[in-house]
Amino acid sequence: GSTVPPMVNVTRSEASEGNITVTCRASSFYPRNIILTWRQDGVSLSHDTQQWGDVLPDGNGTYQTWVATRICRGEEQRFTCYMEHSGNHSTHPVPSGNSHHHHHHHH
């Protein structure tokens, strides 16, 4: 099949006091190989500070996955989600506290 670029969506949720969990989801992409990882101030976070979902079929012949990490509230602007798929790449910021969803479709 032809390349289908992912939809990338960054959300935040309350974790413990002073911390939030930020999750970067990629969906509706093909082929299944995708890089999704968090950066802080442009530097990659270690594997042991991130949690990944498996790359799973979403029922439409395309795939979905996610990566999450826990950060200190107030430091959201230091973190970005990096996505690389089929030679295309993009970075996605954490939404501010009053906005919980950012959707981007990449071509």
């Epitope: 190989n33 995708i34 890089i35 999704l36 990882t37 950066r39 442009g42 990659s44 270690s46 594997h47 042991d48 990944w52 979902g53 498996d54 790359v55 996955t65 990566v67 990096y82 690389e84 089929s86 030679g87 295309n88 790449h89 970075t91």
Partner: antibody
Framework: QVQLKESGPGLVAPSQSLSITCTVS????????VNWVRQPPGQGLEWLGM???????DYNSALKSRLSISKDNSKSQVFLKMNSLQTDDTARYYC??????????????WGAGTTVTVSS | DIQMTQTTFSLSASLGDRVTISCSAS??????LNWYQQRPDGTVKLLIY???TLPSGVPSRFSGSGSGTDYSLTISNLEPEDIASYYC?????????FGGGTKVEIK
């Protein structure tokens, strides 16, 4: 066929800088990361740093102040520059393609390496 | 940095033998471990990633296992072309670090 090939100066004088080029084929640098690893004679392997598809770089903090990694996507070349070389920088320098998929991160194809000797 | 220790610097075995190479990490690495083979001419090849996954083209006589801090690589039936040094590598924390290597020789 995925290939990487390093080319370097061979001999570098102490306190001088080192420049090595990694020329790749069979894949695009916009869609893959490239790592640099070195091996001093008779010793183990040491990761130096990497450059991602978007040009962002990560470095080994022990060497970060002396290292610079860059690339030219159109020429399929990745460059390693290291400053202030000393004799303990004598090593074989490898470039290797990185595969970074979720919980899996590995160096799936390596160049043959280029030997760098630091000596006056 | 995480220290990776391969306590056996070299070992001698006969062709057809089962060979096990051990690797220990200075802290838990959550299966974030790869193995590489370095031939005498310096050529490096990926053997196993994420503790136990074999890349395509790697013979099935190679296998990997482990968890927490302790990992191993097993060659079930030593062949002449397996004469090489073997390195473990963790990627749980940056920087990725390698063990000191285990050299396998023929008796």
């Amino acid at each position: 066929q995925v290939q990487l090939k390093e080319s370097g100066p061979g001999l570098v004088a102490p306190s001088q800088s080192l420049s090595i080029t990694c020329t790749v084929s069979g894949f695009s640098l916009t869609g893959s990361g490239v790592n640099w690893v070195r091996q001093p004679p008779g010793q183990g392997l040491e990761w130096l740093g990497m450059i991602w598809g978007d040009g962002n770089t990560d470095y080994n903090s022990a060497l970060k102040s002396r290292l610079s990694i860059s690339k030219d996507n159109s020429k399929s070349q990745v460059f390693l520059k290291m400053n202030s070389l000393q004799t303990d920088d004598t090593a074989r320098y490898y470039c290797a393609r990185g595969a970074h998929y979720g919980k899996r991160w590995y160096f799936d194809v390596w160049g043959a390496g280029t030997t760098v000797t630091v000596s006056s | 940095d995480i220290q990776m220790t391969q306590t056996t610097f070299s070992l001698s075995a006969s062709l057809g033998d089962r060979v096990t190479i051990s690797c220990s990490a200075s802290q838990g690495i959550n299966n974030y471990l790869n193995w590489y083979q370095q031939r005498p001419d310096g050529t490096v090849k990926l053997l196993i990633y994420y503790t136990s996954t074999l890349p395509s083209g790697v013979p099935s006589r190679f296998s990997g296992s482990g968890s927490g801090t302790d990992y191993s690589l097993t060659i079930s039936n030593l062949e002449p072309e397996d004469i090489a040094s073997y390195y473990c590598q963790q990627y749980s924390k940056l920087p990725p670090t390698f063990g000191g290597g285990t050299k396998v020789e023929i008796k």
